[in-house]
Amino acid sequence: IHPSGVTGLVPSLGDREKRDSLCPQGKYVHSKNNSICCTKCHKGTYLVSDCPSPGRDTVCRECEKGTFTASQNYLRQCLSCKTCRKEMSQVEISPCQADKDTVCGCKENQFQRYLSETHFQCVDCSPCFNGTVTIPCKETQNTVCNCHAGFFLRESECVPCSHCKKNEECMKLCLPPPLANVTNPQDSGTA
């Protein structure tokens, strides 16, 4: 393989996989000599310089404050720690350490509503007013409510059927229950 130099932050995934496959697990291909396999740096550290020859140590250094690496690596720089987003009402569950990223979450009685693949807003769990709790609120899912008669579920809240407009989906939920099939005595006789 043509060595990619590994001077940037992260080599492309394809390059990395190809380079890694030339060496046993826990080792990587020397950036300038692809006949040498060097030991990867432990999590919490990053690569300063490749091993000078087989069997000699790779030079690794601990990640500085505000940075981390969560697995064995040969990164030239640690990754920046995540910051919990106050404007999304997130709270820090555990701080960033050299070997693990910050963990962000929500306060009690809140759930994570994802606005995108990786960003979530902390939102109060629905209390199910005018209904009963079917499934309690979870980390990433709002309470599931079962609404009382005369109410329908709209975005996790029980809304009065008077708020249901014609032709809306809620019409089905707000129909009065069918009357019991009572036979009329006048209909039961014979002609």
């Epitope: 606005l115 995108s116 960003h119």
Partner: nanobody, 119 residues
């Protein structure tokens, strides 16, 4: 290529109103969540609001809830942000975004529109 062009910013007094627009092109606008983010002078990017593809679901940061309204017109490929009861702390460059993760993970390169709230 995704193109987003923000407009409508300007100088406004505290308590005043502004309506921002974002003209989108280069992607199927009606299929995507859309977002407003802002960057106050000397600060990082801050999420403001999100709207679902149909426009039926809207989400707001606590700091703007009840004052700002996000909306969209899918027939015009345009996103809006109606800003009422503006405060000095709303002063920022406002950006619309189609990919929130990308925008909040990097320094944003969009042009944005500057909103200045001052008496």
């Amino acid at each position: 290529e995704v193109q987003l062009l923000e407009s409508g910013g300007g100088l406004v007094q505290p308590g005043g109103s502004l309506r921002l627009s974002c003209a989108a092109s280069g992607f199927t606008f009606r299929k995507y969540d859309m977002h407003w983010v802002r960057q106050a002078p000397g600060k990082g990017l801050e999420w403001v609001s999100t709207i679902s593809p149909s426009g039926r679901r809207t989400y707001y940061a606590d700091s703007v809830k009840g004052r700002f309204t996000i909306s969209r017109d899918n027939s015009k490929n345009t996103l809006y942000l109606q800003m009422n009861s503006l405060r000095a702390e709303d002063t920022a460059v406002y950006y619309c975004a189609e990919n929130l993760d990308q925008v909040l993970s990097f320094d944003y390169w969009g042009q944005g529109t500057l909103v200045t709230v001052s008496s």
